[in-house]
């Protein structure tokens, strides 16, 4: 049976018999009998429970160095077996043993739950020598005990390579319940059941759990820890906590918010970062996610033009990053742009619409009726064309780009010329004689360079040839342009 010493109990004696320093005669463990007697007990009796055989760890009797006498077995005296106290109290307990003086260099060590206690522990060993035996008291004290001090403490003594072990002293530190698992915040679907878990431990046990929702206790009857609360469903946000109580008091867990998933709020601050003739780069600030991660977003684009049919172009994109390049737009056009994002519950409303414009585009058609002829006297090539019929979206014509390629005996050289928008003719110097010159012309606006016209070739003869017939682009649908000599 365990001897219990509650904190309110009177201090227990260090020894069951007289104080150390005198021979112990009553409740003796026979260690104090003169070792010259040769008496060897077969059993050791517990001093706390006389008449019951003691089966603790004892040192086997052995012959002395003189070889003449037997020594009785050595064993620690019984002390209190179980100490129960509250957290933050102080505790002191001890082991005692009487050792015949024939033994030298006896040391006592303290062990807790199988591990030796070293270093910064308050352990004191006192020696009380007598004629034939020395009473040794090893005291262990803990100030302001904590739960971590709970455990089984024993003394060990080494004599002549033999180890003597005391009975365990169980220290039980009692306090308020301590949470090992607390409820966690969750985001849940409306009217859908979910579970919360709470677990707390003593000592003392049992620990009982009450659940609290929005400051109201949910269960009239406590549940033994651990407890799982099944909530059948919520229609609005709620705060849950659990209260754990034992015979020492009550501890409350952290309060956790259970949120109801909803559609996201609309994105805000849609911004234009870059516009080209056919694309617009936008960004946005996501709205509140409705307690559910964003899945994707939708960019909605409407052309702002009285003549347009008002249709909406929809571009789906990932929710992150919060940017999207809208492509396939018309040049020099006005658009209204909005963004909506979705989570598992549904789509948000559309963000406030913003206006954006594309820039001028490059011309989409080449100059017409390109004609090339040689003005041999001046060593020049004359080029003439007609202004292309560009759309408004291409913007204002700023000029033309002329590409002329000279090919002769395996050598090829391309040159580019720029001329103003008011011109419809140009002259270029002959670069090489006895060569072919291929001419293409493209219209240029602020939006860029349009497509080049079909190539027109003219042969530049060696010096002495005379032929001023022009070359020109054919009418639409004709074969490739030919050189007219």
């Amino acid at each position: 049976a365990i001897t219990e010493a509650r904190e309110e109990a009177k201090p227990y004696p260090l020894f069951p018999g007289p104080l150390p320093g005198s021979l112990q005669t009553d409740h003796t463990s026979l260690l104090s009998l003169p070792h010259t007697s040769g008496y060897q007990p077969a059993l050791m009796f517990s001093p706390t429970q006389p008449g019951r055989p003691y089966t603790g760890n004892v040192a086997i009797p052995r012959v002395t160095s003189a070889g003449s006498k037997l020594l009785p077995p050595l064993a620690f005296k019984h002390t209190v077996g179980h100490i129960i106290l509250s957290e933050h109290k102080d505790v002191k307990f001890n082991c005692s043993i009487s050792v015949p003086n024939i033994y030298q260099d006896t040391t006592i060590s303290w062990w807790k739950d199988g591990k030796e206690l070293l270093g910064a522990h308050h352990a004191i060993t006192q020696f009380y020598p007598d004629d034939e035996v020395t009473a040794i008291i090893a005291s262990f004290s803990i100030t302001s005990v904590q739960r971590s001090d709970n455990g089984s403490y024993i003394c060990k003594m080494k004599i002549n390579n033999e180890e003597i072990v005391s009975d365990p002293i169980y220290i039980e530190v009692q306090g308020l319940p301590h949470f090992t698992k607390q409820p966690e915040s969750m985001n849940v679907t409306r009217n859908t059941a979910f579970n919360l878990t709470c677990q707390a431990v003593g000592p003392p046990e049992p620990v009982n759990i009450f659940w609290v929702q929005n400051s109201s206790r949910v269960n009239e009857q406590p549940e033994k820890s651990p407890s799982v609360l099944t909530v059948p469903g919520l229609t609005e946000m709620a705060v849950f906590s659990c209260e754990a109580h034992n015979d020492k008091g009550l501890t409350v867990s952290k309060g956790v918010q259970i949120n109801i998933k909803a559609i996201p709020s609309p994105p805000t601050e849609v911004s234009i970062h870059n516009s080209t003739a056919h694309s617009i780069l936008i960004s946005w600030v996501p709205g509140f996610d409705g307690y559910s991660p964003f899945r994707n977003c939708s960019v909605q684009v409407k052309e702002v033009d009285p003549l347009s049919n008002g249709s909406v172009m929809i571009f789906n994109t990932s929710a992150s990053p919060h940017m999207y390049q809208i492509k396939q737009l018309q040049a020099l056009a006005n658009y209204s742009i909005g963004v909506s994002c979705m989570n598992e519950i549904g789509w948000s409303a559309v963000s406030p619409w913003i206006l954006a414009s594309t820039t001028e585009g490059a011309p989409s058609v080449a100059p017409l009726n390109v004609t090339v002829f040689l003005n041999e006297s001046r060593d020049n090539v004359d080029i003439r064309w007609m202004k292309p019929l560009t759309k408004r979206q291409a913007g204002e014509l700023v000029g033309y780009r002329i590409s002329h390629v000279w090919q002769s005996a395996g050598i090829s050289k391309e040159l580019l010329e720029e001329v103003g928008q008011n011109n419809s003719r140009a002259q270029i110097s002959v670069q090489v004689h006895n060569a072919t010159c291929t001419v293409r012309i493209a219209a240029v606006t602020k939006g860029g360079v349009g497509p080049f016209s079909d190539p027109v070739k003219i042969f530049i003869p060696a010096h002495g040839w005379v032929d001023h017939a022009p070359s020109s682009t054919p009418a639409p649908g004709n074969a490739d342009p030919v050189l007219i000599i």
Partner: antibody, heavy 114, light 109 residues
Framework: QVQLKESGPGLVAPSQSLSITCTVS????????ISWVRQPPGKGLEWLGV???????DYNSALKSRLTISKDTSKNQVFLKMNSLQTDDTARYYC????????WGTGTTVTVSS | QAVVTQESALTTSPGETVTLTCRSS?????????ANWVQEKPDHLFTGLIG???SRAPGIPARFSGSLIGDKAALTITGAQTEDEAIYFC?????????FGGGTKLTVL
């Protein structure tokens, strides 16, 4: 639903002892500590003592020498015994759940008179 | 032993908010005093309203709330109703015993 019901003798002679039983239903005494409280006529409430789930007890220090609280968990009953009653022990005696004083019995009136 | 003090009587009107307080002679009331509020109605009917960590007992209307205000425990009734007319006792736990206040008689006119 948790319910507590007190039963007592009603009339006790001075210097005699009082025994009251609190019968608990809807909950096990192994998970509910029970306190005893009394209210003298026209006065406030006075806490008498508690019996813990593990069977330990704590008492009002002014009454400790005269009080004993015990329980029979198998019958779900808690017992209050008070010795050496005097006329100022006349009161209505209640048992109540402990950490939350939210479940009370209806009480039993005890009159100390010769 | 600690003495727990409450207002002896308070009067309020239906729909008004009223706060009852509970003071300890030993100093500030803390969470470890587990302030409990108990309502007494005629015919010895006691009902616990608030306990533990200022949580309402099951079935107690949300207009009753417990808190610690300054160095006192408080019971606030937000939007008092005529049926709230009663005597309200506060109880504080001191390590190993409860101490009850003298009670506050609340009248709802």
């Amino acid at each position: 639903q948790v319910q507590l019901k007190e039963s007592g003798p009603g009339l006790v002679a001075p210097s005699q002892s009082l025994s009251i039983t609190c019968t608990v239903s809807g909950i096990s005494l192994s998970s509910f500590a029970i306190s005893w409280v009394r209210q003298p006529p026209g006065k406030g409430l006075e806490w008498l003592g508690v019996i813990w789930t593990g069977g330990g007890t704590d008492y009002n220090s002014a009454l400790k020498s005269r009080l004993t609280i015990s329980k029979d968990t198998s019958k779900n009953q808690v017992f209050l015994k008070m010795n050496s009653l005097q006329t100022d022990d006349t009161a209505r005696y209640y048992c109540a759940s402990h950490w939350y004083l939210d479940v009370w019995g209806t009480g039993t009136t005890v009159t100390v008179s010769s | 032993q600690a003495v727990v003090t409450q207002e002896s009587a308070l009067t309020t009107s239906p729909g008004e908010t009223v706060t009852l307080t509970c003071r300890s002679s030993t100093g500030a009331v803390s969470t470890s005093n587990y302030a409990n509020w108990v309502q007494e109605k005629p015919d010895h009917l006691f009902t616990g309203l608030i306990g533990g960590a200022n949580s309402r007992a099951p079935g107690i209307p949300a207009r009753f709330s417990g808190s610690l205000i300054g160095d006192k425990a408080a019971l606030t009734i937000t939007g008092a109703q005529t049926e709230d007319e009663a005597i309200y006792f506060c109880a504080l736990w001191f390590s190993n015993h409860w101490v009850f206040g003298g009670g506050t008689k609340l009248t709802v006119l």
